[in-house]
Interface confidence: medium
């Protein structure tokens, strides 16, 4: 497997609306035009796939309609946004990039972005 360096921020704080955004940047050594980006979540030594998208260089990322992820691409950067997050979703979100086609195939896995999600305090009952 040909390795590829992937960089992503160490820490991101989700907004009060449960939205977190971060940039996943890969050092493309190849001439790929079809790229697959996968977001993995690691928590309690368990790794699960959050979302994935395949895109053509220069085009938009296309996630499944029911995906909690959206994203845009610019050169070797992918701007990822994860929505609908709650406190229980706090964890390490790892960006995995694959240069799918044409060969040779390259694989890069980032060190992960720790996303902290704080549930908003419920509004106190009003006497009015």
């Amino acid at each position: 497997c040909k390795a590829m360096h992937v960089a992503q921020p160490a820490v991101v704080l989700a907004s009060s609306r449960g939205i977190a955004s971060f940039v996943c940047e890969y050092a493309s050594p190849g001439k790929a035009t079809e790229v697959r980006v996968t977001v993995l979540r690691q928590a309690d030594s368990q790794v699960t796939e959050v979302c994935a998208a395949t895109y053509m260089m220069g085009n938009e990322l296309t996630f499944l309609d029911d995906s909690i992820c959206t994203g845009t691409s610019s050169g070797n950067q992918v701007n990822l946004t994860i929505q609908g997050l709650r406190a229980m979703d706090t964890g390490l979100y790892i960006c995995k990039v694959e240069l799918m086609y044409p060969p040779p195939y390259y694989l890069g896995i980032g060190n992960g972005t720790q996303i902290y999600v704080i549930d908003p305090e419920p509004c106190p009952d009003s006497d009015f």
Epitope: E34, M56, M100, P103, P104, Y105, L107
Partner: antibody, heavy 124, light 107 residues
Framework: EVQLVESGGGLVQPGGSLRLSCAAS????????MHWVRQAPGKGLEWVSA????????YYADSVKGRFTISRDNSKNTLYLQMNSLRAEDTAVYYC?????????????????WGQGTLVTVSS | DIQMTQSPSSLSASVGDRVTITCQAS??????LNWYQQKPGKAPKLLIY???NLETGVPSRFSGSGSGTDFTFTISSLQPEDIATYYC?????????FGQGTKVEIK
């Protein structure tokens, strides 16, 4: 049995259009990159076009760019080649071929399954 | 575009002879090279992929070697059923290109 069967060839006048089809069976069509390769009478092989799994990625030889369009319908297990503005030099047997990615981490590609070919003749 | 030059363009050999075909790329293509056999009126058949790997079901008398720009295809002991045209093909970059072919005949 793994099989590719081309159809749609025939005689067409210069400037005309033709649509070739390639029906795949015996394998998971959507898991493979697909190609068209042609061979003019008595000549060698010439790669024409390729399309990735989803159909989003398309590639063409300079000689057909802007005139030919490759597409696929994974639900029908079928590959297509729409050929417009045909020229006499497009006369050839057109083969569809399966691109097998190989190696420990998919570092190469080879045409491991070929159709029988369909003849396209461009002549007035 | 990467040009692939095969030599010879044709050859005639006796049954049992060792046959060698060479393929030269116009630029370094690492080991990104395949070899195909095409019999008259038939579709090509993959013999060797990645310069030296024998495709499943292909007789062991066929072999390939080389890297960079110079590649060799060998039939260790020519058989009557090996009468065909042989093509090299690079997959280093698009457009994918083939050699012009080598026609092998029996003396």
């Amino acid at each position: 049995e793994v099989q590719l069967v081309e159809s749609g060839g025939g005689l067409v006048q210069p400037g005309g259009s033709l649509r070739l089809s390639c029906a795949a069976s015996g394998f998971t069509f959507s898991s493979y990159v697909m190609h068209w390769v042609r061979q003019a009478p008595g000549k060698g092989l010439e790669w024409v076009s390729a399309i990735t799994w989803s159909g989003r990625g398309t590639y063409y030889a300079d000689s057909v760019k802007g005139r030919f369009t490759i597409s696929r319908d994974n639900s029908k297990n079928t590959l297509y080649l729409q050929m417009n503005s045909l020229r006499a030099e497009d006369t050839a047997v057109y083969y569809c071929a399966r691109g097998r990615l190989f190696g420990l981490a998919l570092y190469g590609e080879a045409f491991d399954v070929w159709g029988q070919g369909t003849l396209v003749t461009v002549s007035s | 575009d990467i040009q692939m030059t095969q030599s010879p363009s044709s050859l005639s050999a006796s049954v049992g002879d060792r046959v060698t075909i060479t393929c030269q790329a116009s630029k370094d293509i690492s080991n990104y090279l395949n070899w195909y056999q095409q019999k008259p009126g038939k579709a090509p058949k993959l013999l060797i992929y990645d310069a030296s790997n024998l495709e499943t079901g292909v007789p062991s008398r066929f072999s390939g070697s080389g890297s960079g720009t110079d590649f060799t295809f060998t039939i260790s002991s020519l058989q009557p059923e090996d009468i065909a045209t042989y093509y090299c093909q690079q997959f280093n970059s698009f457009p994918l290109t083939f050699g012009q072919g080598t026609k092998v005949e029996i003396k």
